[in-house]
């Protein structure tokens, strides 16, 4: 999880705490960088990110997506709906995310700061969402078994999987920042 | 096109209230934060309010903090800024501008602003 | 007095290059990439140049270019033209969720 504060802040005059609207920001961008970090072992370890192959496993995976109705896109945003969309969805990733966690030699530590920063990201949004009552929390059994589903694929579809969970959160979250800089 | 056209300034009295107001057309206003931003006579440029493209979140400048309040009516694609207590350095020129979209803290559409002049 | 530098003027031949700084602090300029540059010619109502440090807005020429080092920005225009008289500003985000402006610098095109 990124520290509170920016390293140059130090010397500031007064450190004052980053505002709920920056940490989500910051957070959202030290997610990525991770992901950027995960995705280069990927694909260094398989040719997964040059594949056409995608599509048959996208089926067996029902990865978060903005789509229009959502409002988090810039022609018909809405702010309530599309942060509902936000926080519903990467409630949804934290099953993926739980995938990745044995999917990763070198970079293991940053596949646990990934999902670690992204519980953090979702009691930020949490907080500004609190008087949002429409956030559904998935279901554990059907998480348990998805996970047990996933973790018995043969290794092409692993490698697969883990690709695309990767790109789909990196995609979810360059939405969500977008859409959160108009709120 | 994409128009910001302001209305409501004018001359007032110290402690005196205006309400200003912004009518955009040419995109999609409920999609877009908005702000208000001043140019005092030959002086430069100063932020005075946000609001989210929802209205729920608002910012303010500290000079115009407890003075000032920035509304929005998405129905009338209509942006506000009601401003009380007012004082001869609120003089200015009020722009309206529109956020960048997925761009933090960047206006790129201004309209061509109103004049407050505040004296007695 | 403006929460960010600019010097009050510049001045260059057309064709030649001149850059305008705007120095901050690490609250603002060196909080991150959140810089952007206006031009308002005279008269006129501002208009964006640069947005998140150095990336051109739609329809700005390639001539401006915006960078950033530390807490200081800088706003870069190469092959002045006549037209390019103006005050230009820049802004910042600043902690706290606000905005701040340089006082403005006015860019003479001389000749």
């Known amino acids: 999880v990124p520290p509170g504060e920016d390293s140059k802040d130090v010397a500031a005059p007064h450190r004052q705490p980053l505002t709920s609207s920056e940490r989500i920001d910051k957070q959202i961008r030290y997610i990525l960088d991770g992901i950027s970090a995960l995705r280069k072992e990927t694909c260094n370890k398989s040719n997964m990110c040059e594949s056409s192959k995608e599509a048959l496993a996208e089926n067996n995976l029902n990865l978060p997506k903005m789509a229009e109705k959502d409002g988090c896109f810039q022609s018909g945003f809405n702010e309530e709906t599309c942060l509902v969309k936000i926080i519903t969805g990467l409630l949804e990733f934290e099953v993926y995310l739980e995938y990745l966690q044995n999917r990763f030699e070198s970079s293991e530590e940053q596949a646990r700061a990934v999902q670690m920063s992204t519980k953090v990201l979702i009691q930020f949004l949490q907080k500004k969402a609190k008087n949002l009552d429409a956030i559904t929390t998935p279901d554990p059994t059907t998480n348990a078994s998805l996970l047990t589903k996933l973790q018995a694929q043969n290794q092409w579809l692993q490698d697969m999987t883990t690709h695309l969970i990767l790109r789909s959160f990196k995609e979810f979250l360059q939405s969500s920042l977008r859409a959160l800089r108009q709120m | 096109e994409v128009q910001l056209v302001e209305s409501g300034g004018g001359l007032v009295q110290p402690g005196g209230s205006l309400r200003l107001s912004c009518a955009a057309s040419?995109?999609?206003?409920?999609?877009?934060?908005m702000s208000w931003v001043r140019q005092a006579p030959g002086k430069g440029l100063e932020w005075v309010s946000r609001?989210?493209?929802?209205?729920?979140?608002?910012y303010y400048a500290d000079s115009v903090k407890g003075r000032f309040t920035i509304s929005r009516d998405n129905a009338k694609n209509t942006l506000y800024l009601q401003m009380n207590s007012l004082k001869p350095e609120d003089t200015a020129v009020y722009y309206c501008?529109?956020?960048?979209?997925?761009?933090?803290?960047?206006?790129?559409?201004w309209g061509q602003g109103t004049q407050v002049t505040v004296s007695s | 007095s403006y929460d960010l530098t600019q010097p009050p003027s510049v001045s260059g031949s057309p064709g030649k290059t001149v850059t305008i700084s705007c120095a901050g602090t690490?609250?603002?300029?060196?909080?991150?990439?959140?810089v952007s540059w206006y031009q308002q010619l005279p008269g006129m109502a501002p208009k964006i140049l640069i947005y998140?440090?150095?990336k051109r807005a739609s329809g700005i020429a390639d001539r401006f270019s915006g960078s950033k080092s530390g807490n200081t920005a800088s706003l870069t225009i190469s092959g002045l033209q006549s037209e390019d008289e103006a005050d230009y500003y820049c802004?910042?985000?600043?902690?706290?969720?606000?905005?701040?402006f340089g006082g403005g610098t006015h860019l003479t095109v001389l000749g």
């Open positions: 501008v529109r956020y960048a979209w997925g761009v933090q803290w960047a206006f790129d559409f």
């Open positions: 040419g995109f999609t206003f409920s999609s877009y934060a």
């Open positions: 609001i989210s493209s929802g209205g729920i979140s608002t």
């Open positions: 690490s609250s603002d300029v060196g909080y991150g990439n959140y």
């Open positions: 998140d440090v150095n």
């Open positions: 802004a910042s985000y600043r902690r706290g969720e606000t905005i701040v």
